[in-house]
Amino acid sequence: MQKGDQNPQIAAHVISEASSKTTSVLQWAEKGYYTMSNNLVTLENGKQLTVKRQGLYYIYAQVTFCSNREASSQAPFIASLCLKSPGRFERILLRAANTHSSAKPCGQQSIHLGGVFELQPGASVFVNVTDPSQVSHGTGFTSFGLLKL
Amino acid sequence: MQKGDQNPQIAAHVISEASSKTTSVLQWAEKGYYTMSNNLVTLENGKQLTVKRQGLYYIYAQVTFCSNREASSQAPFIASLCLKSPGRFERILLRAANTHSSAKPCGQQSIHLGGVFELQPGASVFVNVTDPSQVSHGTGFTSFGLLKL
Amino acid sequence: MQKGDQNPQIAAHVISEASSKTTSVLQWAEKGYYTMSNNLVTLENGKQLTVKRQGLYYIYAQVTFCSNREASSQAPFIASLCLKSPGRFERILLRAANTHSSAKPCGQQSIHLGGVFELQPGASVFVNVTDPSQVSHGTGFTSFGLLKL
């Protein structure tokens, strides 16, 4: 693209961060091999990627988790990519589900989500999971990003 | 993009190749429905995609494997997307892990990795797995690619 | 990209639709948080995305399904991304496989496929699965899309 000032590249890739918060929203950081192309996309409060320009974006997330069927609820582990646009309700854009493993103490599994969506100026995307304590934060296991088409 | 000569499209998609080598680095080939946009990205030694231009790239890999919990080590099957830049350490960009299946003789599972990263001229990306003998090489099961934003 | 009329953005993201048809080809709809950039990509017969312009496209699909090892065939659940070009045979571009879960009544799992491919004018891509009745159609679980580089 090597776009001019009128149309700069907009892309982000952030890295998972363990959190003591009990919220189901995953936390992210600009650390390790992260990407933040410019201030037209920002990581806000360590939890959401917010864009300044309207347009089509490919948005993705990868979550690796370790869980055990006996120690977890009956429900599967679900990762959700969610959207909050100014003046609109939160929306689920994408979800993936994996049943818990029978491996002990826990079995690792990875989920990948990705899709093309129209975002408005000021729109934020974030990732929700059913149990954040099960998420793996080792190098490369859990990440979140987007790129503007 | 239909970019001009100054800014051509750069993209690659290569297909897995079974290998008698004992290395954990997967082997790839320009065969079947592969993509190699031009010589600004090349497949080197059948194992790594090397780029000539600096910039942001969306890099992805998909690995399908067949394993059995009893016949495999305790550790999960891990696929890693790795980067080697001139004058820098090899680094893990992305990893995914799946616990082995209890299905017999083995249970198939698929892993997908993808993210946006800044690559330097001469940078190479490659895919490592814990056990290459478990990888599935049937049409479409295991592939690796990138596109320059 | 904010491309001009000569080179408009081309992208689509469609949402899974439950179907009474017995075909293995998944059905899709322009509903919910879908994307259809313009008429250079169209959803035909609710089953395939068809492009009007030649070029490189990143094509992806995500399929979430719920299955049980005892109630399913021995064979794994397989999702295939397929291509039909004018005057050519159908081709498998990408496949992913997941062994059925032992969870009851069924265990959910998600598959993600994605890659860069050259498409000809009039080419269509579609998604095949081994058992469409096992596919999850809840919000965000199963989707299909593409973007032109």
Epitope: G32, G140 | S80, C82, R88, F89, I92, R95 | -
Partner: nanobody, 118 residues
Framework: EVQLVESGGGLVQPGGSLRLSCAAS????????MGWFRQAPGKEREFVAS????????YYADSVKGRFTISADNSKNTAYLQMNSLKPEDTAVYYC???????????WGQGTLVTVSS
């Protein structure tokens, strides 16, 4: 500010062993890597070995594979390079470095001399 201090270099006979240490003051961070380059007299600096700080992966130059082992002790903020079956061609100044990902090779040690000679 992170600083790296190497130790463990010295004179050793061919076939002998040495263990280099690289102690970090400050935080390494889980998503960074540590490792060694070396520079022999009159030659360019070359990669020796590296390790992801969380133990995710270890990498070696072909010339040292099977002879050198890199490890990390997170609790001590220290990386180690165990060098066995040393050869005269391993003689060089060994530099410890941190790879900060997007930030590049952002911290270097001052170097420690390893001499392999009879």
């Amino acid at each position: 500010e992170v600083q790296l201090v190497e130790s463990g270099g010295g004179l050793v006979q061919p076939g002998g062993s040495l263990r280099l240490s690289c102690a970090a003051s400050g935080n390494i961070f889980i998503n960074n890597a540590m490792g060694w380059f070396r520079q022999a007299p009159g030659k360019e600096r070359e990669f020796v070995a590296s390790i992801e700080w969380d133990g995710g992966g270890a990498y070696y130059a072909d010339s040292v594979k099977g002879r050198f082992t890199i490890s990390a002790d997170n609790s001590k903020n220290t990386a180690y390079l165990q060098m066995n079956s040393l050869k005269p061609e391993d003689t060089a100044v060994y530099y410890c470095a941190r790879d900060g990902g997007t930030y590049g090779m952002d911290v270097w040690g001052q170097g420690t001399l390893v001499t392999v000679s009879s």
